[in-house]
Interface confidence: medium
Amino acid sequence: MKVLQEPTCVSDYMSISTCEWKMNGPTNCSTELRLLYQLVFLLSEAHTCIPENNGGAGCVCHLLMDDVVSADNYTLDLWAGQQLLWKGSFKPSEHVKPRAPGNLTVHTNVSDTLLLTWSNPYPPDNYLYNHLTYAVNIWSENDPADFRIYNVTYLEPSLRIAASTLKSGISYRARVRAWAQCYNTTWSEWSPSTKWHNSYREPFEQH
């Protein structure tokens, strides 16, 4: 049994880091493998992660972490029974994938303005709370070409757009994702999408 693709890990910079790797053949990850991880810190203890299958030869493990600070470094040991298959390390702050925003809501009752709001996925005491920026994706269910991205580079988790920038009388969906420039993170997953029917009063045309 050998590791074909070494584990790569990303952290949500809060409580979970996810590591993925591939073996050289079909493997029952949860029964055959264990990923041991330990914070390089005098008071820390080793923890064991039981991997799950992620395709025939792929494995994924969700490492639980109390909290994360930028100086943290973890040792990782991948075991198959008594055999050490791979040894490495992982610095969460250098491999951050933020949590996805939640509670995306479209408020349509604000005088021909659409107000989209969502929740910051981090608690206020987390470093990323004040460092997230967002991308909002809006698309038409009827027209695949009607697909747009709005970059929200301010901290407030909201976006206002004129309803008239979208077509009237059809349904739209929106979703939002986050990233943090400070740690050069990857984008988060998209939030669940929300749907609304776009309608607004056409301006009276004078001839």
């Epitope: 390089v40 810190f41 005098l42 008071l43 820390s44 109390d66 909290d67 600070v69 930028s70 100086a71 943290d72 470094n73």
Partner: antibody, heavy 120, light 106 residues
Framework: QVQLVQSGAEVKKPGASVKVSCKAS????????INWVRQAPGQRLEWVGW????????YYNEKFKDRATLTVDKSASTAYMELSSLRSEDTAVYFC?????????????WGQGTLVTVSS | DIQMTQSPSSLSASVGDRVTITCRAS?????MHWYQQKPGKAPKPWIY???NLASGVPSRFSGSGSGTDFTLTISSLQPEDFATYYC?????????FGQGTKVEIK
């Protein structure tokens, strides 16, 4: 809100022992490392050792290993530091302080300090 | 033992000044903490793990550094900031503190 309340000032003769208490409220002490730190007049802070009440494990600064004893009474939420064979250079304010792994062992709560004076 | 050396040992500054205190470890460490102490009082936690402000610490304070060199910076000194600041390491035993930096009013 966690509070650490220490026993009152002590005056001791050289060669004697002193036992300082540190009572915790708002915390069960279970997940806390209770540290003892001293500060002689005008000097830097000096770490004596820690005790982990969850299992009674303790760890000492080699400098104090032979003279300091750290204990805990979990039922009373109280930690103790006993220092024996006192000498004049042990005159200092002794603090208890909680260290949490979550904050990478930052001492986040401190007692008010107990002045121990060693004088003949 | 890892020796922690702070510089300067004391400094005089005026309200509004930018102040930087440095702490050098005699060998590389992974976690550095800072405390503020006022006369007759216990130290208060100020910055943990080099750069994270402890609860209630004003945002004019910041911390940085890694390895052997760490800094505490006050962007605009306020009257309540006059105190002694200590660095501390818990990366190897024994836990050690710097000798302190006393920030005084000019």
């Amino acid at each position: 809100q966690v509070q650490l309340v220490q026993s009152g000032a002590e005056v001791k003769k050289p060669g004697a022992s002193v036992k300082v208490s540190c009572k915790a409220s708002g915390s069960t002490l279970t997940d806390d490392y209770i540290n003892w730190v001293r500060q002689a007049p005008g000097q830097r802070l000096e770490w004596v050792g820690w005790i982990f009440p969850g299992n009674g494990n303790s760890y000492y600064n080699e400098k104090f290993k032979d003279r300091a004893t750290l204990t805990v009474d979990k039922s009373a939420s109280t930690a103790y530091m006993e220092l024996s064979s006192l000498r004049s250079e042990d005159t200092a304010v002794y603090f208890c302080a909680r260290g949490l792994v979550r904050y990478r062992a930052l001492f986040d709560y401190w007692g008010q300090g107990t002045l121990v004076t060693v004088s003949s | 033992d890892i020796q922690m050396t702070q510089s300067p040992s004391s400094l005089s500054a005026s309200v509004g000044d930018r102040v930087t205190i440095t702490c050098r470890a005699s060998s590389s460490i992974n976690y550095m903490h800072w405390y503020q102490q006022k006369p007759g009082k216990a130290p208060k936690p100020w910055i943990y793990a080099a750069s994270n402000l402890a609860s209630g610490v004003p945002s004019r304070f910041s911390g940085s550094g890694s390895g052997t060199d760490f800094t505490l910076t006050i962007s605009s000194l306020q009257p309540e900031d006059f105190a002694t600041y200590y660095c501390q390491q818990w990366s190897s035993y024994p836990i050690t503190f710097g000798q302190g930096t006393k920030v005084e009013i000019k």
